[in-house]
Interface confidence: low
């Protein structure tokens, strides 16, 4: 399997934004790459977001996606927004080299994202 | 050495308060117990706080201590207050059975406490 590296731990900002880099060791010269972010919590795995991009171009997530990202060579800079404390969990980066063949799949070990909900600001009198 | 258990990870609240349980497997019937919290960061170990208590009585930390706690049997519920992001680190629970002899010492594997500084509230006009 293709090697995918990502940080072990990331703390979301108090605004609920977490960013991390997902880096893959490409065995071939891919032109089309698909990146998927999976969340594992209590051993349940759910897809958070996914984007397919052409090497050298921007990542395009769906308009209603909580993810944004940029790519640079074999690195993808991912940002997840709108996180709440209940979203704390292991966020796994899955990278697929879609074209040209052969197809390669790599799964990172996951980035544990910790989110703390902010205290509400006091009402202004 | 006496076994001491503590959680692997704790998130401080947005008010900078972190609580965790330190549980020890007492080989004997101790009446006097000393609990010390150590912080390890960048391989530097510093003492955060310490308290000696009689079994069945409350833990008493110094007045200016950032720690408070309660005990129940072989469990100590520790709370550390006033934490800032720079205080993120590994907090190790050290338990000593002081009396009666023999003396026992146990050191936990540490609780990684993550602290995120809150966003400042907007100025009220």
């Amino acid at each position: 399997a293709m090697h995918v590296a990502q940080p072990a731990v990331v703390l979301a900002s108090s605004r609920g934004i977490a960013s991390f880099v997902c880096e893959y060791a490409s065995p071939g010269k891919a032109t089309e790459v698909r990146v998927t972010v999976l969340r594992q919590a209590d051993s349940q795995v759910t897809e958070v977001c996914a984007a397919t991009y052409m090497m050298g171009n921007e990542l395009t997530f769906l308009d209603d996606s909580i993810c944004t990202g940029t790519s640079s060579g074999n690195q993808v800079n991912l940002t997840i927004q709108g996180l709440r404390a209940m979203d704390t969990g292991l966020y796994i980066c899955k990278v697929e080299l879609m074209y040209p063949p052969p197809y390669y799949l790599g799964i990172g070990n996951g980035t544990q994202i910790y989110v703390i909900d902010p205290e509400p600001c006091p009402d202004s009198d | 050495a006496m076994h001491v258990a503590q959680p692997a990870v704790v998130l401080a609240s947005s008010r900078g308060i972190a609580s965790f349980v330190c549980e020890y497997a007492s080989p004997g019937k101790a009446t006097e117990v000393r609990v010390t919290v150590l912080r390890q960061a960048d391989s530097q170990v510093t003492e955060v706080c310490a308290a000696t208590y009689m079994m069945g009585n409350e833990l008493t930390f110094l007045d200016d201590s950032i720690c408070t706690g309660t005990s129940s049997g072989n469990q100590v519920n520790l709370t550390i207050q006033g934490l800032r992001a720079m205080d993120t680190g590994l907090y190790i629970c050290k338990v000593e059975l002081m009396y009666p002899p023999p003396y026992y010492l146990g050191i936990g594997n540490g609780t990684q406490i993550y602290v995120i500084d809150p966003e400042p509230c907007p100025d009220s006009d």
Epitope: V9, Q40, S43, G110, Q112 | A5
Partner: antibody, heavy 125, light 107 residues
Framework: QVQLQESGPGLVKPSETLSLTCTVS????????LSWIRQPPGKGLEWIGY???????NFHPSLKSRVTISKDTSKNQFSLKLSSVTAADTAVYYC???????????????????WGQGTSVTVSS | DIQMTQSPSSLSASVGDRVTITCRAS??????LAWYQQKQGKAPKLLLY???NLQDGVPSRFSGSGSGTDYTLTISSLQPEDFATYFC?????????FGQGTKLEIK
């Protein structure tokens, strides 16, 4: 040391509710999960569901509509309720501590690391 | 649901033999696999977790290997107390499912 003990009625009538209790010692209910598993006579193991340390539950889809798992931290007890039982629910029922083993990457691998001795339940009129 | 196919379903061997049991998942389970030993009338006992990691107190003659969908439990030199039924279990998303078991008998 870690111990789990299942208890409950050995005989339940069809259409009634099966209620089992798992009493645990040697570990904290606030740090670990607990799974229920059953084994029909002469057959393999079937995972029923779990309750996580934070109270989160998850059930086998085929049993989801009939299963409730809860815990009473003060009594160190977990309970399983299975409604509308039939002869197909005749089995030995086990509870098992559910542990996440973490590595440097913070990637959690789960296992049922300690089991109760099991309690036999027959559904018959 | 992920299906776990264990083989063989039964196996006869002698003390001192090297024995291999395999488990195949219907999809990639990323090493989220545990192996258990169950003796007649007793509860299962965890042998290995994360496919290759030996649980505390389990003899080193037990080992695990594999990745993706294919996993193996090996007993390097069978001892009399090893004759039992062995189950694999995936823990990659729920429902956690078990293999159907391999009964290891004395030849």
């Amino acid at each position: 040391q870690v111990q789990l003990q299942e208890s409950g009625p050995g005989l339940v009538k069809p259409s009634e509710t099966l209620s089992l209790t798992c009493t645990v010692s040697g570990f904290s209910l606030t740090s670990y999960g607990l799974s229920w598993i059953r084994q029909p006579p002469g057959k393999g193991l079937e995972w029923i569901g779990y309750i996580w340390y934070d109270g989160n539950t998850n059930f086998h889809p085929s049993l989801k509509s009939r299963v409730t798992i809860s815990k009473d931290t003060s009594k160190n007890q977990f309970s399983l309720k299975l409604s509308s039982v039939t002869a197909a629910d005749t089995a030995v029922y086990y509870c098992a501590k559910t542990e996440g083993h973490y590595y440097g990457s913070n990637y959690g691998y789960y296992a049922l690391d300690y089991w109760g001795q099991g309690t036999s339940v027959t559904v018959s009129s | 649901d992920i299906q776990m196919t264990q083989s063989p379903s039964s196996l006869s061997a002698s003390v001192g033999d090297r024995v291999t049991i395999t488990c195949r998942a219907s999809e990639n389970i990323y090493s989220n696999l545990a192996w258990y030993q169950q003796k007649q009338g007793k509860a299962p006992k965890l042998l290995l977790y994360a496919a290759t990691n030996l649980q505390d107190g389990v003899p080193s003659r037990f080992s695990g290997s594999g990745s993706g969908t294919d996993y193996t439990l090996t007993i390097s030199s069978l001892q009399p107390e090893d004759f039992a039924t062995y189950f694999c279990q995936h823990l990659w998303g729920t429902p956690y499912t078990f293999g159907q078991g391999t009964k290891l008998e004395i030849k």
